[in-house]
């Protein structure tokens, strides 16, 4: 006994088989890549009359894959799922088993088809083996049950009730048909679901409709100084076995950032990082920095913590500023000899302007290189000077200088000259070192002084007294120098003049 060729399949393949196809042979169907198999993949060659072979079931079909297909949860009263789980996509299968004392009619497996329906056959049914049946259940207002199209129900079957959107089930959700032919409970009812009033909303208010049925919206508003954190409205929705409001906002306090600091001034009031809405800060300027100068507040002295369009804490305006009232102060153009101004050159010098000086090459700056125009219109400190050291003062013949062994001769240094006894100073006795590094006036000279004789003469050279030697003396013809006498002369320090004598 053998079977004929297996039924063909569009967009699919049949596993290899050889002919004749003997009873007991299993052939398998499969689909091409983009197609899904709907139906049993295996066919068995059987015989019912022991004469001819026949295939035990129709061939499956291959459907073009529909990624959008989705089938509903299949329910078989008196049965349960033994294969398959949600979500059900195109080509997924579900297999059912019947509960004890129920027998199955139809195929135990169905497939999710491209049209979102279960197939290729209808869902199986599980039929009770008991004769007693429960009466048909009533429909419930605003709800449904799983046996709406069934006349009477066999013992062991369960009926599940559900309510339409916006209604809640009151009573038993599942009632069972007992073997006595009675229902295990009375049918439930569907009551309109109502949310509880939201009541007090901290730091704000809530506007809700008079009847709080499912689907209505409550709107939230915050008190001044608070802003909504979260959704501005909440909906009454079904949640599990009850109703609830969707996520509600909170009113959070609005804060301003720390008040902005100002130069030459300060604020009184709040200086925290977070300043509460409505807080006020007052700005004042620092005390007068010096006599004749004071700070003037320009702008609003008071700022308030307010909100912007985004409900963000912001100050009511910009911070004021503290400006010096020194517009009348003017300093003269600063001057420096043998130097130049290296920064701060201007046509006009006003309060707090500064200039910096430098000296010409070879000159040294004496004083502060930087000076400032003060409130009195004078430069502070006074302008520096550029000066040069003098060379050591020259020595003079027949005289000496009083330099106390100095090695440096800064401008302003004064040196005194004096002449030896018997000599007189011609010129100024003191010279000064000028800023240009030059001695002034010219160095004096020591000239031979005339002797104002005292009338005292010595024949021997005095010891420890100044004696001006006679260097120019000469004798007339027929005479020669011989010996000396010493004539005392008047002076600050008495001194002696040598007089040479001539003899024949």
């Amino acid at each position: 006994i053998s079977c004929g060729s297996p039924p063909p399949i569009l967009n699919g393949r049949i596993s290899y088989y050889s002919t004749p196809i003997a009873v007991g042979t299993v052939i398998r169907y499969s689909c091409s890549g983009t197609f899904r198999l709907i139906g049993e993949k295996s066919l068995l060659c059987i015989t019912k009359d022991k004469v001819d072979g026949t295939w035990d079931k129709p061939a499956p079909k291959c459907e073009y894959f529909n990624k959008y297909s989705s089938c509903p949860e299949p329910i078989v009263p008196g049965g349960y799922k033994i294969r398959g789980s949600t979500p059900y996509r195109h080509g997924d299968s579900v297999t059912f088993a019947c509960k004890t004392n129920f027998s199955m009619n139809g195929n135990k497996s169905v497939w999710c088809q491209a049209n979102n329906m279960w197939g290729p056959t209808r869902l199986p049914t599980c039929v009770s083996v008991f004769p007693l049946e429960c009466p048909a259940l009533p429909m419930i207002h605003n709800g449904h049950h799983t046996s709406e199209n069934v006349g009477s129900i066999a013992p062991g079957l369960s009926v599940t009730y559900s309510c339409e959107s916006g209604y809640l089930l009151v009573g038993e959700k599942i009632i069972n048909c007992l073997s006595s032919g009675k229902w295990s409970a009375v049918p439930p009812t569907c009551e309109e679901a109502r949310c509880k009033s939201l009541g007090r909303f901290p730091n704000g208010k809530v506007k809700e409709p008079p009847i709080l049925r499912v689907g209505v919206t409550a709107n939230f508003f915050c008190d001044e100084g608070y802003r909504l954190q979260g959704p501005p409205s909440s909906r009454c929705v079904i949640a599990g076995q009850g109703v609830a409001w969707t996520k509600m906002p909170v009113c959070e306090e609005i804060f301003c950032p720390s008040p902005p600091p100002i130069l030459n001034g300060r604020h009184i009031g709040n200086s925290l990082a977070n300043v509460s809405y409505g807080s006020i800060v007052t700005y004042t300027c620092d005390p007068d920095p010096e006599e004749g100068v004071n700070f003037i507040l320009i702008g609003e002295s008071t700022l308030r913590c307010t909100v912007d369009s985004q409900k963000t804490g912001t100050w009511s305006g910009p911070a004021p500023r503290c400006e010096l009232s020194t517009s009348a102060v003017q300093c003269p153009h600063p001057q420096i000899l043998r130097g130049r101004m290296v920064s701060g050159q201007k046509d006009r010098y006003t309060y707090n302007d500064t200039v910096i000086f430098a000296c010409m090459f070879g000159f040294t700056l004496k004083g502060s290189k930087q000076i400032r125009c003060n409130a009195q219109g004078t430069w502070e400190p006074s302008a520096p000077v550029c000066e040069k050291e003098c060379q050591a003062p020259p020595n003079i013949l027949n005289g000496q200088k009083e330099d106390r062994h100095m090695v440096r001769f800064d401008p302003g240094t004064s040196i005194k000259y004096s002449c030896n006894p018997g000599y007189v100073l011609v010129g100024e006795e003191s010279i000064q070192c000028t800023s240009e590094g030059v001695w002034t006036p010219p160095v004096p000279q020591c000239k031979v002084a005339a002797c104002e004789a005292t009338g005292r003469q010595l024949l021997t050279k005095p010891q420890h007294q100044f004696v001006r030697p006679d260097v120019n003396s000469s004798c007339g013809e027929g005479y020669k120098l011989s010996g000396s006498v010493y004539q005392e002369c008047q002076g600050t320090i008495p001194w002696f003049m040598e007089i040479r004598l001539c003899k024949e």
Epitope: Y80, K81, I82, K99
Partner: antibody, heavy 117, light 105 residues
Framework: EVHLQQSGAELVKPGSSVKISCKAS????????MHWIKQQPGNGLEWIGW????????EYNQKFNGKASLTADKSSSTAYMQLSSLTSEDSAVYFC??????????WGQGVMVTVSS | EIVLTQSPTTMTASPGEKVTITCRVS?????MHWYQQKPDASPKPWIY???KLASGVPDRFSGSGSGTSYSLTINNMEAEDAATYYC????????FGSGTKLEIK
């Protein structure tokens, strides 16, 4: 009355295979699903898979694909489970169970399989 | 797969005490079944379809829950109730909880 009688304890070597049986009585063998469940010593329960003896249809827990193979003999109302490539991890008690009403309402007494060299 | 988390893992109760075992589910299921197992014995069906007592189960036992949270309650603990209880869900692959070992004081 429904009764599920399982075969005796097995001591097997690593790498080998073992086939254990579950003889059913008291109900229509071909119309009910037979499940197999694993319980390691001191451990919980793990579902291996089922067989529908009426047409030989099977469903496995992916974890046991290639490890367990379920078959049934309608003539003797016996379900079988073959475990292959055995390791110490396969040492456990294996139960057959019937799901008459959508839960495991009848259980076999269990078979202890010990994998040891 | 759906993971069932039972708590507590072990517990000790005095006779007459009320005992509750919970089973949390990683994603919503329609029903929960419970089994009782005593040492060296096969598990027995105890509560099926969340709240129905299996044949021969004393009425001090009850089951409740929905979605992702289920529980088994013993209203008046007795010595014979000492056992390990497993929850089990019927979405494929079928999975069991890790068990709660209940001991008598």
């Amino acid at each position: 009355e429904v009764h599920l009688q399982q075969s005796g304890a097995e001591l097997v070597k690593p790498g080998s295979s073992v086939k254990i049986s579950c003889k059913a009585s008291g109900y229509t063998f071909t119309s009910n699903f037979m499940h197999w469940i694993k319980q390691q010593p001191g451990n919980g329960l793990e579902w291996i898979g089922w067989i529908y003896p009426g047409d030989g249809d099977t469903e496995y827990n992916q974890k046991f694909n290639g490890k367990a193979s379920l078959t049934a003999d309608k003539s003797s109302s016996t379900a079988y489970m073959q475990l292959s490539s055995l390791t110490s991890e396969d040492s456990a008690v294996y139960f057959c169970a019937l799901s008459g009403d959508g839960y495991f309402d009848y259980w076999g007494q269990g078979v202890m399989v010990t994998v040891s060299s | 797969e759906i993971v069932l988390t039972q708590s507590p893992t072990t517990m000790t109760a005095s006779p007459g005490e009320k005992v509750t075992i919970t089973c949390r589910v990683s994603s919503s299921v329609s029903y929960m079944h419970w089994y009782q197992q005593k040492p060296d014995a096969s598990p027995k069906p105890w509560i099926y379809e969340t709240s129905k007592l299996a044949s021969g189960v004393p009425d001090r036992f009850s089951g409740s829950g929905s979605g992702t949270s289920y529980s088994l309650t013993i209203n008046n603990m007795e010595a014979e109730d000492a056992a390990t209880y497993y929850c089990q869900q019927w979405n494929f692959p079928l999975t069991f909880g890790s068990g709660t070992k209940l001991e008598i004081k």
